[in-house]
Interface confidence: medium
Amino acid sequence: KSSSEATNITPKHNMKAFLDELKAENIKKFLHNFTQIPHLAGTEQNFQLAKQIQSQWKEFGLDSVELTHYDVLLSYPNKTHPNYISIINEDGNEIFNTSLFEPPPAGYENVSDIVPPFSAFSPQGMPEGDLVYVNYARTEDFFKLERDMKINCSGKIVIARYGKVFRGNKVKNAQLAGATGVILYSDPADYFAPGVKSYPDGWNLPGGGVQRGNILNLNGAGDPLTPGYPANEYAYRRGIAEAVGLPSIPVHPIGYYDAQKLLEKMGGSASPDSSWRGSLKVPYNVGPGFTGNFSTQKVKMHIHSTSEVTRIYNVIGTLRGAVEPDRYVILGGHRDSWVFGGIDPQSGAAVVHEIVRSFGTLKKEGWRPRRTILFASWDAEEFGLLGSTEWAEENSRLLQERGVAYINADSSIEGNYTLRVDCTPLMYSLVYNLTKELESPDEGFEGKSLYESWTKKSPSPEFSGMPRISKLGSGNDFEVFFQRLGIASGRARYTKNWETNKFSSYPLYHSVYETYELVEKFYDPMFKYHLTVAQVRGGMVFELANSVVLPFDCRDYAVVLRKYADKIYNISMKHPQEMKTYSVSFDSLFSAVKNFTEIASKFSERLRDFDKSNPILLRMMNDQLMFLERAFIDPLGLPDRPFYRHVIYAPSSHNKYAGESFPGIYDALFDIESKVDPSQAWGEVKRQISIATFTVQAAAETLSEVA
């Protein structure tokens, strides 16, 4: 392997030594330690955990470990004035109120500072009105309501089920539809897997369980008051009215017992089809308002949360590279949790901790990586990826010049079925090669490779005998590194069987029931899946930091660029008449992709054949590989999304969690048939095609022979 050629002090200090040092029992111990009390961003408990991690990383042997703090906008419920939703009668009397907190799990009854369920950054307000059920509150759900069913949400409180898309997109869609408030709930159809018991007897969501979460639409901005710049002591802060991404209407989450009470009385229009019906024993009528006998009753929200500038703390650990200390490979994951964080994030943080310990053990024996490895424990991820984004804003000049790769390390598990990887195409071959060397933890695959079980359980839709790797979207701390700075990024975790478990996320996501016991009893009793994820994440970091030649294959980018060009062309071709009328052509884009493919192929030949012992040549070739991802960055950003600058990938405008390819062209084409000025709309499509063409061609040229 290429890593064996690297700067190992002795032959035993190789990838195998690093992987062999990783222990499931340690991950288990670390997870238990990290999950005994809540670690909400901005609280004393999370500051204390930051200091503990700093201390332990120093003990493990890192060269330096620093706390970096920022003062960012966070949001909390009012402790003396709880949030809730009522059904009120014609006299204004509250005849039903939603719960004020989740019933705590056994053994945690006396834990203080469990934040009650709330939608972070909701404005205060007490809207009152008729209810409209809007399914998942996706773009297409509002199209169905407004265009097909002619239902007007203006002045109404909408109730939407969690799932399918990021909750912030739901709120944005409701605002655009004119709603005065949003109620989010977890439907058993999405958060209760058939045949599994509710927590504490299984891993399903009980009726009193509620998903917390932020409802921002930051589009990569970081702290809402300091977009583009670190939220330090001399930062200029916007007023709340000018803050980025804050919702304008009150929002509150509830569980399915409470949702039953709101939905069972719904009248008005019937649901359009079965895709709008969940698993509660209610009619799933759309409304507006309650049926017959209850038509005089209304819904009232009581939201009193406050947003306040609060100090957060990242932990940044450094393991200096022996040969290229100015080249950074970053492993980062967040530390803050909504409550106990049994899965999110501490199943990831425990893995990072064990990876640091293993690297530290090798370092204590005299080894150093070729390149510098940075380890990060991010704060305030749950409040909008704030810790990672502020740190990257503060260090952007260093990162754009020195950043080789970023590996994300949030939740290690969201199931225990198979591996899930999302990454830049540059890392495909790294991931394939690594997983071929690792042992599968799956039952029935004893003695087989992880690659084999992964390929069997999650096959690529395009290439036979290969596993699926997905596009990077957002909703996690890689966002600023990949979408803003253009640093090659990847993430890996164990996941569920998407064929049989179609619920969104895992049922207990962001609830009080996400405990150590949930993981230890139901998901990974032997911590073998955690160990496998540690091996994948740690192995990727080891190779990226230690390989003489960076383990990036630019030919894989060429393959996906062709696939994405075909896809966007086919979308456009749904409008053949308009393409003809407005002279819309994709020829230039396909030409640029062809050029990229040819140049990438030639570059790969030179990479194979060049003299690896020549340090200048080696550095030159590695820089071309490192800067390829950077070449896809447009400094002007995407339309109305200046911090999403990657031209090939961006978070979907309709679902932050999902990645979209050629997002500029995609958004220009989206719903184009409804645009009032088709000439202008198709002009924008042409502009976006030209930007994509230029970017692909410019990126290709960075791989050409230098002189």
Partner: nanobody, 127 residues
Framework: EVQLVESGGGVVQPGRSLRLSCAAS????????MHWVRQAPGKGLEWVAY????????YYADSVKGRFTISRDNSKKTLSLQMNSLRAEDTAVYYC????????????????????WGQGTMVTVSS
């Protein structure tokens, strides 16, 4: 051991007040709705009041509405029933009972069932 222990019963004149308490142990009190139920001499069981696990919802039988108030203190694992304007027909053994559904929020029309009972405390309203 799962236990509910009522206290506070006694003899009281019509129109006066009494406060019943129920101490819970052996289960996650803060996760369950709680009820008061009564049984008058020679009669069947009558449901009196319900409070949700977090205290946000309280429901009462029509016969006690406006006179009785159910409350709970999750930190102390206690359930209370404040009985005002007592009448002769309120004479009964009062039981506190745990709802079987963890975190369930009952509506006024629901049929109530219980999985853990106390031993009861006698309330006699007589002049």
């Amino acid at each position: 051991e799962v236990q509910l222990v009522e206290s506070g019963g006694g003899v009281v004149q019509p129109g006066r007040s009494l406060r019943l308490s129920c101490a819970a142990s052996g289960f996650t009190f803060s996760g369950y709705g709680m009820h008061w139920v009564r049984q008058a001499p020679g009669k069947g069981l009558e449901w009196v009041a319900y409070i949700s696990y977090d205290g946000s919802n309280r429901y009462y039988a029509d016969s006690v509405k406006g006179r009785f108030t159910i409350s709970r203190d999750n930190s102390k694992k206690t359930l209370s029933l404040q009985m005002n304007s007592l009448r002769a027909e309120d004479t009964a053994v009062y039981y506190c009972a745990k709802d079987p559904a963890w975190g369930l929020r009952l509506g006024e029309s629901s049929s109530y069932d219980f999985d853990i009972w106390g031993q009861g405390t006698m309330v006699t309203v007589s002049s």
